[in-house]
């Protein structure tokens, strides 16, 4: 068997197979070792003794979408059956006290693979043996803790493979250069150490994407607004546009990015090359956000110039690319194979994100203010608590509700949260009376709110013993 | 036993640069990637980034604006963190963690003040 | 990202009481949660992962619970060393591998 009858149905073209070259990967046309790893289709009945005490769960996942040319990561984290787990040795033990449908065990061990390798390996001392390989045949790397890794998880995509041997989760990395753009599907199988040979336990895939323009995303922040996800703001508050690159293994780090914005508020075209802006619209409805990024990132080279007179036509600029993996720092798998080497050509090409949005401006309450503190004198005998009003001030809405939030001095422990709905007049001025059990010191948090938005101000105040000599005192505004 | 030892505090000019560094010790080096984490003041942590001893690929998390690059010096089981173009919002303290899949041993955290 | 969220940021308990702290994630991480104690001017220290096991060493008045989205971390009977902080934090698929913002235990 082949290593693409064993993995998978997926089989790119030709052109595909020859043009995706995936550095450090091999093509799968190569030889299966089926003998000491045996290929289960899916539904046989072997799958359901793979694995002792049920079945072992593959998760697959990666920070897809990467723009060509970048590096992708995919990590496969392996789910055990309950009460089962990797330990320090990479042995496969029972939780202590757990108990799953067999009750408690009494074998520590699932599978006690450091026991296993002792048994097996003495033919030479050395480990390597003719069954510590790959199911290609090639040998296991020997680093000083090989014997603790027990899982092989070989990778599938685009008509090649990667062999690799890991614990209970591993990461990969490949470099995109080559990858052709669009949706692409990577397979992986998971087999365990079974004595001299191995076992399937799980398979799963996971579409990736690669593509040639730079994933963008906008977060929106502004004071005083309710809710920052529902794309509705306030008129007259700057608004914070943070653009986030999805960017995770930092190919455009070295590259200068520059953000063209158009607020749709016919004030014109904004450039910069901070990835913050500020904007304040001063007119409620509806408008259309667009961004546009612009990075010089590392890419191919294009092909030399023909020459003058051409006795055969000249290839294709497909077949003539060269990649180049930048040279930031980013992640790597196991296996120093798994990133690209980085040829002498050090070309650019121009790559473009985008991100539109559609943000509706409404009135909201702008800002609050307390101008004035009353401690409201309470009939003999003195009670424990105490009354204030505060007098407020706000500007912009009119406010629907009123809270106030007494915490600790550090305004960090909440002691008492009271929310009340407010009839406000139109000069806004409102008087808000609240109790403190107790003299001392306390942080006041005070929130007036309508529909879209929420003012707060912040005071610390200090509650004197019920002595009448006794002011009460703003400590800090 | 596992150990984790990192440098000593220190105190450096903004702009400046800064290599941390974190001696392994207890275990075999190569077979746990090495984490780094940072915690300013009264703050919560942060992962930084973690590097393969085995081969030396580094991951960095894109979303803190940290200028840092890991590396490992395999003959003397020492993971290294430089940090460059200090700013005072880099004064914190910074953890390396052996991981398995997740952080079972840390360092005791080295200092770092970033003051004009 | 995958984002964590934990709550409450700030608690404060009597020795012998019974607390729990709750961790959420953005998305699905499965059993791939941690949970970590750190003591003032210390290092973190692994006290469960998987979500529900606990470390060596840590006692069982401790207890993890949750998966896919929600988790949460119990301690019964508080003792005075269990003050602190905790932290969680997943450990699934790929970086960065972040935490929630933590939960300050203090003494009533």
């Known amino acids: 068997k082949r290593f693409h009858d064993v993995l998978g149905n997926e089989r790119p073209s030709a052109y595909m197979r020859e043009h995706n070259q995936l550095n450090g990967w091999s093509s799968d046309e190569n030889d299966w070792n089926e003998k000491l790893y045996p290929v289960w289709k899916r539904g046989d009945m072997r799958w359901k003794n793979s694995w002792k005490g049920g079945r072992v769960q593959a998760v697959l996942t990666s920070d897809s979408p990467a723009l060509v040319g970048s590096n992708i990561t995919f990590a496969v984290n392996l789910i055990f059956p309950r009460c089962q787990k990797e330990d320090a040795n990479g042995n496969i033990v029972y939780e202590k006290n757990c108990r799953n449908e067999a009750g408690l065990s009494a074998d520590p061990y699932v599978y006690n693979w450091t026991a296993w390798s002792e048994d097996s390996d003495g033919e030479n001392g050395t480990g390597q043996s003719h069954h510590n390989v790959f199911p290609d045949g090639k040998p296991f790397p020997h680093h000083p803790g090989w014997r603790r890794w027990n899982f092989i998880y070989v990778f599938h995509t685009l008509g090649q493979y990667f062999q690799k041997l890991g614990r209970c989760s591993v990461r990969v990395s490949v470099n995109t250069a080559n990858v052709t753009l669009g949706p692409q599907l990577m397979e992986v199988t998971v087999y365990r150490r079974h004595g001299r040979a191995y076992v399937p336990i799980a398979q799963v895939k996971d579409v990736y994407v690669v593509t040639d323009q730079i994933p963008v995303f906008v977060t929106m922040f502004q004071k005083n607004d309710r809710n920052s996800s529902d794309e509705t703001f306030l008129k007259d508050l700057p608004i914070m546009f943070d653009v986030l690159i999805h960017d995770p293994s930092h190919f455009l780090n070295y590259s200068t990015i520059n953000y063209k914005w158009s607020f749709g508020d016919n004030t014109g075209l904004f450039v910069s090359t901070n990835h913050t802006v500020n904007h304040t619209y001063v007119l409620n409805g509806t408008f259309s956000l667009n961004l546009t990024v612009k990075a010089a990132a590392p890419g191919p080279c294009p092909p030399p110039p023909p020459p003058p007179r051409p006795s055969k036509p000249t290839p294709s600029l497909a077949t003539t690319l060269k990649s180049y993996d930048s040279n930031t720092p980013g992640p790597a798998g196991d296996n120093p194979l798994e990133l690209s080497r980085i040829p002498d050509e050090n070309c650019q090409i121009n790559r473009y994100g985008h991100f539109q949005a559609t943000i509706t401006i409404v009135e909201g309450i702008l800002e609050v203010n307390i101008i004035q503190m009353t401690d409201v004198l309470m009939p003999v005998p003195w009670p424990e608590s105490s009354l204030i009003d505060f007098v407020v001030t706000c500007q912009g809405s009119i406010p629907t509700e009123v809270c106030t939030i007494i915490s600790d001095p550090t305004c960090e422990i909440t002691q008492n949260t009271v929310c009340s709905p407010v009839d406000v007049d139109e000069m806004c001025l409102l008087t808000v009376r609240r109790t403190f059990n107790g003299s001392g010191t306390y942080c006041v948090n005070l929130t007036l709110g309508d529909d879209t938005s929420l003012a707060l101000t912040s005071t610390l105040i200090s509650v004197p013993d019920r002595d009448p000599a006794s002011p009460l005192r703003m400590a800090n505004s | 036993e596992v150990q984790l030892q990192q440098s000593g505090p220190e105190l450096v000019k903004p702009g400046a640069s800064v290599k941390i560094s974190c001696k392994a010790s207890?275990?075999?080096?190569?077979?746990?990637?090495m984490n780094w984490v940072r915690q300013s003041h009264g703050k919560s942590l942060e992962w930084i980034g973690d590097?393969?001893?085995?081969?030396?690929?580094?991951t960095y998390n894109q979303k803190i604006k940290v200028k840092a690059t890991l590396t490992v010096d395999k003959s003397s089981s020492t993971a290294y963190m430089e940090l460059r173009s200090l700013t005072s919002e880099d004064s914190a303290v910074y953890y390396c963690?052996?991981?398995?899949?997740?952080?079972?041993?840390w360092g005791q955290g080295t200092t770092l003040t970033v003051s004009s | 990202d995958i984002q964590m969220t934990q709550s409450p940021a700030s608690l404060s308990a009597s020795v012998g009481e019974t607390v729990t702290i709750t961790c959420r994630a953005s998305?699905?991480?499965?059993?791939?949660l941690v949970w970590y104690q750190q003591k003032q001017g210390k290092s973190p220290q692994l006290l469960v992962y998987?979500?529900?096991t606990l470390a060596e060493g840590v006692p069982s008045r401790f207890s993890g619970s949750g998966s896919g989205t929600q988790f949460s971390l119990k301690i019964s009977s508080l003792q005075p060393e269990d003050f602190g902080s905790y932290y969680c934090?997943?450990?699934?698929?790929?970086?960065?591998?972040?935490f929630g913002g933590g939960t300050k235990l203090e003494i009533k």
């Open positions: 963690a052996r991981n398995w899949p997740y952080f079972d041993y």
């Open positions: 590097i393969n001893p085995y081969h030396g690929g580094s």
């Open positions: 207890g275990y075999t080096f190569t077979d746990y990637y």
């Open positions: 934090q997943h450990h699934f698929g790929t970086p960065p591998y972040t």
């Open positions: 998305e699905n991480i499965y059993s791939f």
């Open positions: 998987n979500a529900k």
